[in-house]
Amino acid sequence: TPEVWVQVRMEATELSSFTIRCGFLGSGSISLVTVSWGGPNGAGGTTLAVLHPERGIRQWAPARQARWETQSSISLILEGSGASSPCANTTFCCKFASFPEGSWEACGSLPPSSDPGLSAPPTPAPILRAD
């Protein structure tokens, strides 16, 4: 069964800066990755970035840099101030569309106990079959 993992990290140098890393553990070919915050995409969440393996990468504030790390994992740096700034309990979700498995999504947030600069361990947070 495919899994999606999500890792959220707050940067020690900038407390309003977060790095979200997501990966897909499956054998299929990834066709699209969507990163959202405030809940799953299409269920009240707001899209921060859309990454296609060949067509390109698009992102919207407060996302600063979305990139492919490998063929099956991505990272997104967020920074903000004021209303568009993420906070410690913000939920971030990553949805991977793949062939032939379909769409798989997981969400994660910064663990309450984590210190700035420390990573939350990669969590295959509740995995939702979104298809």
């Epitope: 707001t46 859309v50 393996p53 060949e54 390109g56 698009r58 990139r67 492919w68 063929q71």
Partner: antibody, heavy 114, light 113 residues
């Protein structure tokens, strides 16, 4: 497949403003993220910016900041582009296109003339 | 901004001929994480909007005839039409799909003798 239907041609006077629309009808969420592209007669294409239907978030080509304003009405699936302080340099065909430019509207011709 | 330079600016060929056009970018369009090139090619026929032909430098969009082939990596890219047809009369544009602003080349005009 997504269809992008743009509003009709506009003829406006220098200094005026105009707002053109692009209605998307598709079946995937990426069909509603809209890019805007300018093409002057006999010239190449220029990316103006894009708009995110979730929250109206935008990205602009620096060249068009202050000239173009991109908005979206998520409920109707319609994106809008406002252009202000129009001059003859703004006379062009303006296209909307989906997130990764795989579908395009038919174009809206803007003529700025006194 | 990434500058896209296309050559030649125009081509005049006979039906059935093989055609090659070039696109060079001022910065690499290769995404190091997944080793994909974010470059697209478009065809624009008179009075029509552009149509996506190729993305990822070499992947044909659905429905595009296989006589159209994209190749290249980094900063140098090529669009090849293996056997030109009369309906291929059009302007061809390359586009940086790597980073904002998503700049287009000046175009290559394909004319049929």
């Amino acid at each position: 497949e997504v269809q992008l239907q743009q509003s009709g041609p506009e003829v406006v006077k220098p200094g005026a403003s105009v707002k053109i629309s692009c209605k998307a009808s598709g079946n995937t969420f990426t069909d509603y993220f809209i890019n805007w592209v300018k093409q002057r007669h006999g010239k190449s294409l220029e990316w103006i910016g894009d708009v995110n239907p979730d929250n109206g978030g935008t990205n602009y080509n620096q060249k068009f900041k202050g000239k173009a304003t991109l908005t979206v009405d998520k409920s109707s699936g319609t994106a809008f582009m406002g252009l202000r302080s129009l001059t003859s340099e703004d006379s062009a065909v303006y296209y909307c296109a989906t997130l990764f430019f795989d579908s395009w509207g038919q174009g809206t011709t803007l003529t700025v003339s006194s | 901004d990434i500058v896209m330079t296309q050559s030649p600016s125009s081509l005049n060929v006979s039906a059935g001929e093989k055609v090659t056009m070039s696109c060079k970018s001022s910065q690499s369009l290769l995404n190091s994480g997944n080793q994909k090139n974010y470059l697209a090619w478009y065809q624009q026929k008179p009075g029509q909007p552009p149509k996506l032909l190729i993305y990822g430098a070499s992947t044909r969009e659905s429905g595009v005839p296989d006589r159209f082939t994209g190749s290249g990596s980094g900063t140098d890219f090529t669009l090849t039409i293996s056997s030109v047809q009369a309906e291929d009369l059009a302007l061809y544009y390359c586009q940086n799909a790597h980073s904002s602003p998503y700049t287009f080349g000046g175009g290559t005009k394909l004319e049929i003798k």
